[in-house]
Interface confidence: low
């Protein structure tokens, strides 16, 4: 989790001088309670957008909405805390508004958004907003969360970001699998337009099983930049098992930008069909 | 083992000039972004300027622009911060950084404190 760019991170709007800072997640409020606090946030909203920083890259952001209640506790606010959890690894980011002046009641809803942290492809985070100074212990919790789920490198808008492109996001290898006589697979794909190797790895399964009972690594060199794009066709010879028919192609690339990190691409051939076994039609019809 | 070493920081009156340099070894230089990147006492990190593997693109924050240049020399594997019109606010451990694509930096040199003081 991070903060895109050190570029100047801006939340004053008319009528308010805000400045944002670095927080600890751990608002001094919590320590030093004090006997009035504002209200919650109202309308929380988490929507994924992208930014580019100032080197040209594109990252998605989480873009974070809110707006106040209209009651006397803006009276209150001093600030917001914005806390991002990423869910898989507990790890937390948070920044914190601070409001250098006093919020007035004016004719719109007052409405903060702030679109700085940098997300990862297929990962999710519960995003809070913290009205500042905290309640005391046993007050009114004055906060609202909601979960954010980031789409993976398939989803047309990340497929071109940075984070996406450096995994090999833009490599379509177009896997074709043919099975061949002779318990063989024929695999073929298309080449990346980097000098680099691949690996198709191999996984047999049983017709309705999930552990494997066949497995297999075939290592394919680094291609010479005239067979950029072009199909590599390789033949495996599968093990002769009854019933292990099932099989999964996986091929993984060794590209610079992600060395033995980058996005898997895989195909799968199932067992096949086998004919209902028809009830025998016997040789004459009886009479009764 | 990548190594950065800033030079060139000292106590300097308001309106005056200085240039720190930076040292990198360890890692292919001339294929990295570089960043001067600041620290005021008490207060966070703060990017200064950034500048392109060959020196094409320069940019700045804006509170140093007109009065900052940032500048490299690939043969020497260096990075330069030119300071002129300094101010007090400009009081700061300056750091010299390999910068990332993503905006972001690592790893640090040890820094060179500047202070701007009459």
């Known amino acids: 989790l991070r903060l895109l760019d050190h570029r100047a991170l801006v939340c004053s709007q008319p009528g308010l001088n805000c400045t944002v800072k670095n927080s600890t997640c751990l608002d001094d409020s919590w320590i030093h309670p004090r006997n009035l606090t504002p209200s919650s946030p109202k309308d929380l909203q988490i929507q994924l957008h992208f930014a580019h920083t100032q080197q040209g890259d594109l990252f998605p952001v989480a873009h974070i909405e809110w707006t106040l209640q209209t009651d006397a506790s803006i009276l209150y606010l001093e600030g917001a805390e914005l806390s991002v959890l990423q869910l898989n690894t507990n790890e937390r980011l948070c920044v914190r508004f601070e409001f250098l002046s006093k919020l007035r009641h004016h004719h719109r809803r007052w409405r903060f958004t702030f679109s700085h942290f940098v997300v990862d492809p297929d990962q999710e985070y519960e995003v809070t907003v913290h009205h500042l100074p905290k309640p005391i212990p046993d007050g009114d919790p004055n906060h609202q969360s909601k979960n954010f789920l980031v789409p993976d490198c398939e989803h047309a808008r990340m497929k071109v970001t940075t984070p996406c492109m450096s995994s090999g996001s833009l490599w379509d290898p177009n896997i074709t699998v043919e099975t061949l006589e002779a318990h063989q697979l024929r695999v073929s794909f298309t080449l990346w337009n980097e000098s680099t190797h691949y690996q198709i790895l191999l996984t047999s399964f049983p017709h309705m099983e999930n552990h494997s009972c066949f497995e297999h690594m075939h290592h394919i060199p680094a291609p010479r930049p005239e067979e950029f794009h072009q199909r590599s066709n390789v033949t495996l010879t599968l093990r002769n098992l009854k019933g292990c028919c099932r099989h999964q192609v996986q091929i993984q690339p060794f590209f610079s930008s992600c060395l033995n990190d980058c996005l898997r691409h895989s195909a799968t051939v199932s067992c096949p069909e086998m004919p209902d076994t028809p009830e025998p039609i016997p040789d004459y019809m009886p009479l009764w | 083992e990548v190594q950065l070493v800033e030079s060139g920081g000292g106590l300097v009156q308001p309106g005056g000039s200085l240039r720190l340099s930076c040292a990198a070894s360890?890692?292919?230089?001339?294929?990295?972004?570089m960043s001067w990147v600041r620290q005021a006492p008490g207060k966070g990190v703060e990017w200064v300027a950034n500048i392109k593997e060959d020196g094409s693109e320069k940019q700045y924050v804006d509170s140093v622009k007109g009065r900052f240049t940032i500048s490299r020399d690939n043969a020497k594997n260096s990075v330069y911060l030119q300071m002129n019109s300094l101010r007090a606010e400009d009081t700061a451990v300056y750091y010299c950084?390999?910068?990332?694509?993503?905006?972001?930096?690592?790893?640090w040199g040890q820094g060179t404190l500047v202070t701007v003081s009459s």
């Open positions: 950084a390999r910068a990332y694509s993503s905006g972001w930096f690592d790893p």
């Open positions: 360890g890692f292919t230089f001339s294929t990295y972004w």
